[in-house]
């Protein structure tokens, strides 16, 4: 079935929400004054070999648990990330976008990445898909 304008609009809104969440995380941690940044960068993330379609969000979904673990280090009194809630929200969006009925096996690149590289990759992915929808 061809996507309707309403389903396209819904997909676009969900991607924009995902994009904002990922950008918020990146902005919150990727600050040279962040006392924990260097230690956060010792955590490694798997990157998708290919990420051009919504089904490839499976690769993001599989890395949400490690992402939550790193985000547990990012809190401060003035920066309330609430990692569990944030990751839960991202998970709901990802499931809706990729479709829970699809059984796509994610293929990962050989090289692992830092949290900053990982977030930038998925931000770029979201922006790219949004641009095709508009």
């Amino acid at each position: 079935m061809a996507p309707t304008s309403s389903s396209t609009k819904k997909t676009q809104l969900q991607l924009e929400h995902l994009l904002l969440d990922l950008q918020m995380i990146l902005n919150g941690i990727n600050n040279y004054k962040n006392p924990k940044l260097t230690r956060m960068l010792t955590f490694k993330f798997y990157m998708p070999k290919k990420a051009t379609e919504l089904k490839h969000l499976q690769c993001l979904e599989e890395e949400l648990k490690p992402l939550e673990e790193v985000l547990n280090l990012a809190q401060s009194k003035n920066f309330h990330l609430r990692p569990r809630d944030l990751i839960s929200n991202i998970n709901v969006i990802v499931l809706e976008l990729k479709g829970s009925e699809t059984t796509f096996m994610c293929e990962y690149a050989d090289e692992t990445a830092t949290i900053v590289e990982f977030l930038n990759r998925w931000i770029t992915f979201s922006q790219s898909i949004i641009s095709t929808l508009t």
């Epitope: 004054k33 006392p35 924990k36 490694k44 547990n72 809190q75 401060s76 009194k77 003035n78």
Partner: antibody
């Protein structure tokens, strides 16, 4: 009981290599970073570097970069500090410590008992 | 690197005395409302032991006679009533910026 147990004292000659160890027990070893701290005789404490035992990712104090190598074997819950060519100035007590950084904090809550390294010709 | 200057470097005290040790940082160790300053106790031939984290939080199992305060660049460790087991060297440590640095230590000796 959560603890870090370090390998025994070492006496070496200048130019020799050495690898000392720090074994974690009583907790999920890969869930916490391990840091190394040097204390020269009669002196204060100096942070050397850190390893993430889960990923193997490391970060070094610039002062020690290229001088030592930090590694870990998560299968046996052990972190290592090694030298390829010791100098007399490496004579010191070396401690491993567990880093806690969740929430609003960053500190060392558990320390190993220390490994004395003596380098003398 | 952030320099931490402890004072005094050593002093003699008696059991029951109130003891105050100060630690001054060369720049602020605060980040987004939190102070990344910790205090450790070290006895001869032993590893350091955590007393206070994040400037004022008492580590579990540490006696309540120990307390910490301060923010920015000025911090204090206080022992309200010195006990015989408290004679040791105390170090402040900042964890706000790499490399993490320690103060030079304050040795508390028996008068």
């Amino acid at each position: 009981e959560v603890q870090l147990v370090q390998s025994g004292a070492e006496v070496k000659k200048p130019g020799e290599s050495l690898k000392i160890s720090c074994k974690g027990s009583g907790y999920a070893f890969t869930n916490y970073l391990i840091e190394w701290v040097r204390q020269m005789p009669g002196k204060g404490l100096e942070w050397m570097g850190v390893i993430n035992p889960g990923s193997g990712g490391t970060y070094y104090n610039e002062k020690f970069k290229g001088q030592v190598t930090i590694s870990a074997d998560k299968s046996i819950s052990t972190a290592y500090l090694q030298w390829s060519s010791l100098k007399a100035s490496d004579t010191a007590m070396y401690y491993c410590a567990r880093w806690r950084g969740e929430g609003y904090y960053a500190y060392y809550d558990v320390w190993g008992q220390g490994t004395t390294v003596t380098v003398s010709s | 690197a952030i320099r931490l200057t402890q004072s005094p470097s050593s002093f003699s005290a008696s059991t029951g005395d109130r003891v105050t040790i100060t630690c001054k940082a060369s720049q602020s160790v605060d980040y987004q409302g939190d102070s990344y300053m910790n205090w450790y106790q070290q006895k001869p031939g032993k590893a350091p032991k955590l007393l206070i984290y994040s400037a004022s939080n008492l580590e579990s199992g540490v006696p309540s006679r120990f307390s910490g305060s301060g923010s920015g660049t000025d911090f204090t460790l206080t022992i309200s009533s010195l006990q015989s087991e408290d004679f040791a060297t105390y170090y402040c440590q900042q964890s706000n910026e790499d490399p993490y640095t320690f103060g030079g230590g304050t040795k508390v000796e028996i008068k």
